[in-house]
């Protein structure tokens, strides 16, 4: 049985994802996506403008980024947040900004976080402000697996493309 | 003896690491460039110090890393702020932090923003301030473009080789 | 059968992927290593669970990653702090708030930070507070270096696996 | 050498269903997805959806979701698409794939054709 | 859905010509579209991926071209067992989703 009788991280090493036996070894899927400056009050990927790109077989489905061969993967997103004051007499509630990759596979009836950022801010104290959020890791995924974002404060994100995107390249 | 007589970065640079003598295939485009601690005013990047490199072909050119060859790269930065309080007295201005990463190319007459992080900071209220900011990502580069930063704070920065950095790698 | 009657991430463990049995040029080593949140009041690097792993010969030693081979790593580590407001009557002090990447090798007496972010928080400003830090660089490693971790701020670390984690992988 | 063969096609009566399997062999079957194509007569290929018999992950064309279910037997390393509530539009030869990069599909069965109809 | 429009829907061809056939996608896709092609009774075959890459096994006369909406496939000189249907498929949103074919007959 694979790993019997080895230490937790030798049987974690021993237990890894398939490798593909492909001709065109040389391929190297990679995508980056910027987020749909012409949709304001969502978060909708595009990979066919600017800087964004899909290759080697990533592909979208339903705003979510496709794997296309089992194997490491390193993903990771950005989004930046900004907003302006409360005026002095509305009450200063704090604002709960996240962001986050989750990994969708049906072996689980719910989406698995595999990035999270996460900040409070207090917009009657501190005026106009802004805030940038940032992460990538590197995970093992298989072919056919859905990764895609949650974010909390949409209405607040700078969508640009270099401000709001995620991304995620085969090791 | 590698590095002997040498200032402990200049030992660094020095004692690299054996290098294979590998088909061109192999060749693995990488840098990584630290913020000169000794320019307080600007922010120079420097490739021969500390833990700092270029190898199989990048070059730094005018402050810019000059892509080698055609290809999807993952590009990164990030920078370190810190100020102090403002006196009880002064006007409490706020501060823009911004920090950018630049493309320039042929294709295109002015500079492209790659990747941005910004954040309005207001020393009055908080005292001594210290912010981090990163950012990194996949995109497509052709031969000969320039990556550049620019950066709005830069009186600010915490030059250190673990706080300001730039740097990319082929995929 | 696989993960049957487990926990998502003990199933997630149970289930993982075939090695294949590749020729030495193609191993790619990588790990990715989450914070223990069994652990409240330290920071324990765990590879044995949840979508850590360990491969192609890296090892955790004394709570540090074990460089295998000598070249250039992706290094990259994140962290997520959280607190609640001082009580009314208590005096604000500010809390420091720090993490760094750092490595340990034969060639020097010490460690030597890689990658550093800082954040000052003044939790009586600003009630809850939740702050998110993340950085990553390439560097070259060599065989038997010992990459670690050091955190100001422990007992705020939100201990989870898509928040707290730490990794490297060859270029 | 891979191999993908398709059985269980024939005639079906309308509001009836189907299940069609796709034996795979000549590589580790849980290394892929395994796609269902289908081709109506003398028309283009549309694509139906898919499954990882690896993790049992799966994703269809919102055309098909709510009648076709895609699933797999590793311990048989076959594949299988169930379609209920056939209509005569249904008719078509249906392919099973398995592709190199997902997307693309790199390796067909012969195909196996359902034919609805009373 | 996006949706795949070939051109010409047939045509007639002599060995040796070079063949041109031409897909437009009703939105841009990138340059995610791949090339099949179908002789009678028989399965699809991958002939080229990524818009212009040449899939394993695939003569040399078979290439691509494009981006963004319009793509190209082109046989440089047309052989005896080229005679079939091509069809192009975009491979940058799901539905995945194929033309309606060309035929290429013997003239």
């Known amino acids: 049985l694979p790993g019997v009788g080895l230490t937790p991280s030798a049987a974690q090493t021993a237990r890894q994802h398939p490798k593909m036996h492909l001709a065109h070894s040389t391929l190297k899927p990679a995508a980056h996506l910027i987020g749909d400056p012409s949709k304001q009050n969502s978060l909708l990927w595009r990979a066919n403008t600017d800087r964004a790109f899909l290759q080697d077989g990533f592909s979208l489905s339903n705003n979510s980024l496709l794997v296309p061969t089992s194997g490491i993967y390193f993903v990771y997103s950005q989004v930046v947040f900004s907003g302006k004051a409360y005026s002095p007499k509305a009450t200063s509630s704090p604002l709960y900004l996240a962001h986050e990759v989750q990994l969708f596979s049906s072996q689980y009836p719910f989406h698995v976080p595999l990035l999270s950022s996460q900040k409070m801010v207090y917009p009657g104290l501190q005026e106009p402000w802004l805030h940038s959020m940032y992460h990538g890791a590197a995970f093992q995924l298989t072919q056919g697996d859905q990764l895609s974002t949650h974010t909390d404060g949409i209405p607040h994100l700078v969508l640009s493309p270099s401000t709001v995107f995620f991304g995620a390249f085969a090791l | 003896l590698p590095g002997v007589g040498l200032t402990p970065s200049a030992a660094q640079t020095a004692r690299q690491h054996p290098k294979m003598h590998l088909a061109h295939s192999t060749l693995k485009p990488a840098a990584h460039l630290i913020g000169d601690p000794s320019k307080q005013n600007s922010l120079l990047w420097r490739a021969n110090t500390d833990r700092a490199f270029l190898q199989d072909g990048f070059s730094l050119s005018n402050n810019s890393l000059l892509v080698p060859t055609s290809g999807i790269y993952f590009v990164y930065s990030q920078v370190v702020f810190s100020g102090k309080a403002y006196s009880p007295k002064a006007t409490s201005s706020p501060l823009y932090l911004a920090h950018e990463v630049q493309l320039f190319s042929s294709q295109y007459p002015f500079h492209v923003p790659l990747l941005s992080s910004q954040k309005m900071v207001y020393p009055g209220l908080q005292e001594p301030w210290l912010h981090s900011m990163y950012h990194g990502a996949a995109f497509q580069l052709t031969q000969g473009d320039q990556l550049s930063t620019h950066t709005d704070g830069i009186p600010h920065l915490v030059l250190s080789p673990s706080t300001v950095f730039f740097g990319a790698f082929a995929l | 059968l696989p993960g049957v009657g487990l926990t998502p991430s003990a199933a997630q463990t149970a289930r993982q992927h075939p090695k294949m049995h590749l020729a030495h040029s193609t191993l790619k080593p990588a790990a990715h290593l989450i914070g223990d949140p069994s652990k409240q009041n330290s920071l324990l690097w765990r590879a044995n669970t949840d979508r850590a792993f360990l491969q192609d010969g890296f090892s955790l030693s004394n709570n540090s990653l074990l460089v295998p081979t000598s070249g250039i790593y992706f290094v990259y580590s994140q962290v997520v702090f959280s607190g609640k407001a001082y009580s009314p009557k208590a005096t604000s002090s500010p809390l420091y708030l720090a993490h760094e990447v750092q490595l340990f090798s034969s060639q020097y007496p010490f460690h030597v930070p890689l990658l550093s972010s800082q954040k000052m928080v003044y939790p009586g400003l600003q009630e809850p507070w939740l702050h998110s830090m993340y950085h990553g660089a390439a560097f070259q490693l060599t065989q038997g270096d010992q990459l670690s971790t050091h955190t100001d701020g422990i007992p705020h670390l939100v201990l989870s696996p898509s928040t707290v984690f730490f990794g490297a992988f060859a270029l | 050498e891979v191999q993908l063969v398709e059985s269980g096609g024939g005639l079906v009566q309308p509001g009836g269903s189907l299940r069609l399997s796709c034996a795979a062999s000549g590589y580790t079957f849980t290394s892929y997805v395994i796609h269902w194509v289908r081709q109506a007569p003398g028309k283009g290929l549309e694509w139906v959806g898919y499954n990882n018999p690896y993790n049992d992950g799966t994703n269809y064309n919102e055309k098909f979701k709510g009648r076709a279910t895609i699933s797999s037997d590793k311990s048989k390393n076959t594949a299988y698409l169930q379609m209920n509530s056939l209509r005569a539009e249904d008719t078509a030869v249906y392919y099973c794939?398995?592709?190199?990069?997902?997307?693309?599909?790199?390796?067909w069965g012969q195909g196996t054709l359902v034919t609805v109809s009373s | 859905d996006i949706q795949m429009t070939q051109s010409p829907s047939s045509l007639s061809a002599s060995v040796g010509d070079r063949v041109t056939i031409t897909c437009r996608a009703s939105?841009?896709?990138?340059?995610?579209v791949a090339w099949y092609q179908q002789k009678p009774g028989k399965a699809p075959k991958l002939q080229i991926y990524?818009?212009?890459h040449r899939y394993t096994g695939v003569p040399s006369r078979f290439s691509g071209s494009g981006s963004g909406t319009d793509f190209t496939l082109t046989i440089s000189s047309l052989q005896p067992e080229d005679f079939a249907t091509y069809y192009c498929q975009q491979h940058y949103y799901t539905p995945w989703t194929f033309g309606q074919g060309t035929k290429v007959e013997i003239k």
């Open positions: 939105q841009a896709v990138s340059s995610a």
């Open positions: 990524s818009a212009s």
């Open positions: 794939s398995r592709p190199t990069m997902l997307p693309w599909f790199a390796y």
